[in-house]
Interface confidence: medium
């Protein structure tokens, strides 16, 4: 014979546990129904009556099947430097994240208390470690053979273009400038010779391995107090 389905509340068999979406009520000593997400226990079960559930009030939620006496409060409204990436509903908490280009500079369990703009690396410096939701950009000096001519929170140091003949050598904040190459027998007479790098690299190509004279990685550190262009923030 198939086992009878027990309806809550019921006394569990000795040594057995309550079923999914049920909980054991110590006072009633019965298996009772949990409340669904978006609800909470308004009245706990007894030996003869099951849990009475009620909907969460505005600005409160429960995310799981539960038997809590009151719903959880949604977190504070998002601040002006945050965006609400998940709204407060009866079944989920509000989630605030720092707006694009910003990161969380001070957080607690309740969420981010202060967003700050991502640091911008000045010319001569490139991004060594990109910013995340909770960490700032780390800048590093461009190693010999690489440069960055931007003030940016995303640009890395890029290799200098390689010239046949160098007009102006590159440095940490400027690319090399090539001269026009001398005509060779392989070129048609009268051809226009523009400055021509041997290879072209896209903006986002990783820099070539640094020469042995490059600073060690112990140099990778957040730039210290920096002028506004480098990402420090006022009020």
């Amino acid at each position: 014979l198939p086992a009878q389905v027990a309806f809550t509340p019921y006394a569990p068999e000795p040594g057995s546990t309550c079923r999914l979406r049920e909980y054991y009520d110590q006072t009633a000593q019965m298996c009772c129904s949990k409340c669904s997400p978006g609800q909470h226990a308004k009245v706990f079960c007894t030996k003869t009556s099951d849990t009475v559930c009620d909907s969460c009030e505005d600005s409160t939620y429960t995310q799981l099947w539960n038997w809590v006496p009151e719903c959880l409060s949604c977190g504070s409204r998002c601040s002006s430097d945050q965006v609400e990436t998940q709204a407060c509903t009866r079944e989920q908490n509000r989630i605030c994240t720092c707006r694009p280009g910003w990161y969380c500079a001070l957080s607690k369990q309740e969420g981010c208390r202060l967003c700050a703009p991502l640091r911008k690396c000045r010319p001569g410096f490139g991004v060594a470690r990109p910013g995340t939701e909770t960490s700032d950009v780390v800048c590093k000096p461009c190693a010999p053979g690489t440069f960055s001519n931007t003030t940016s929170s995303t640009d890395i140091c890029r290799p200098h273009q390689i010239c046949n003949v160098v007009a102006i050598p590159g440095n940490a904040s400027m690319d090399a400038v090539c001269t026009s190459t001398s005509p060779t027998r392989s070129m048609a007479p009268g051809a226009v010779h523009l400055p021509q790098p041997v290879s072209t690299r896209s903006q986002h190509t990783q820099p070539t391995p640094e020469p042995s004279t490059a600073p060690s990685t112990s140099f990778l550190l957040p730039m210290g107090p920096s002028p506004p262009a480098e990402g420090s923030t006022g009020d």
Epitope: S59, S73, A105, L106, K108, Q109, L114, A116, D136, T233
Partner: antibody, heavy 120, light 111 residues
Framework: QVQLVQSGAEVKKPGASVKVSCKAS????????IDWVRQATGQGLEWIGE????????YYNEKFKGRVTMTRDKSISTAYMELSSLRSEDTAVYYC?????????????WGQGTLVTVSS | DIVMTQSPDSLAVSLGERATINCRAS??????????MHWYQQKPGQPPKLLIY???NLESGVPDRFSGSGSRTDFTLTISSLQAEDVAVYYC?????????FGQGTKVEIK
């Protein structure tokens, strides 16, 4: 306007406990922290800890851990600070203060203070 | 814990003159270009009152003769022209990390 109103003065014996209340009004109680700070007569300010009323999460100064309990009753917008195993050096004015979750990260509104005297 | 040390312990200034209070933290209270340092004023029998938050921001309703400056470990509260009602004890406080800590206070009096 934001207001924090604390319970009245207390006289306690050493070893006893005291529970100070702080009723908030003029803002959404569950949105911001309530901090507790004490000040012995003629002395400076000492931070005891804080509670986030929305979740009930607490952050205690290690110095008071094991002796302090911060709770809240959201239905009446009131925060409580209970200090147990009282000793004479706990005699002080106890203040509650609001600290906004965002922005200032400072205590911008304070209760009037509650004098707790510990004496045998 | 971050230790906050104020100087001087007390200060006597003539009415209309400038008063300067310093506060030094045992380690940096800066994070990402923000200084989590605040200044409070406390008059006898009253709770403290927030004057300056995050090093240099004037709290609403506070007279603009009060100003704050500094970063990392060294901070200053300046009263540009001392008034009789400014007689009080002034405290600095850091909220960069728990436990939040206060300076020992600086008593400002009229000379």
């Amino acid at each position: 306007q934001v207001q924090l109103v604390q319970s009245g003065a207390e006289v306690k014996k050493p070893g006893a406990s005291v529970k100070v209340s702080c009723k908030a009004s003029g803002y959404t109680f569950t949105d911001d922290y309530i901090d507790w700070v004490r000040q012995a007569t003629g002395q400076g300010l000492e931070w005891i800890g804080e509670i986030y009323p929305g979740s009930g999460n607490t952050y205690y100064n290690e110095k008071f851990k094991g002796r302090v309990t911060m709770t809240r009753d959201k239905s009446i917008s009131t925060a409580y600070m209970e200090l147990s195993s009282l000793r004479s050096e706990d005699t002080a004015v106890y203040y509650c203060a609001r600290s906004q979750v965002y922005g200032k990260i400072a205590m911008d509104h304070w209760g009037q203070g509650t004098l707790v005297t510990v004496s045998s | 814990d971050i230790v906050m040390t104020q100087s001087p312990d007390s200060l006597a200034v003539s009415l209309g003159e400038r008063a300067t209070i310093n506060c030094r933290a045992s380690e940096s209270v800066d994070n990402s270009g923000n200084s989590f340092m605040h200044w409070y004023q406390q008059k006898p029998g009253q709770p403290p009152k927030l004057l300056i938050y995050r090093a240099s921001n004037l709290e609403s309703g506070v007279p603009d003769r009060f100003s704050g400056s500094g970063s990392r470990t060294d901070f200053t509260l300046t009263i540009s022209s001392l008034q009789a009602e400014d007689v009080a004890v002034y405290y600095c406080q850091q909220s960069k990390e728990d436990p939040y800590t206060f300076g020992q206070g600086t008593k400002v009096e009229i000379k």
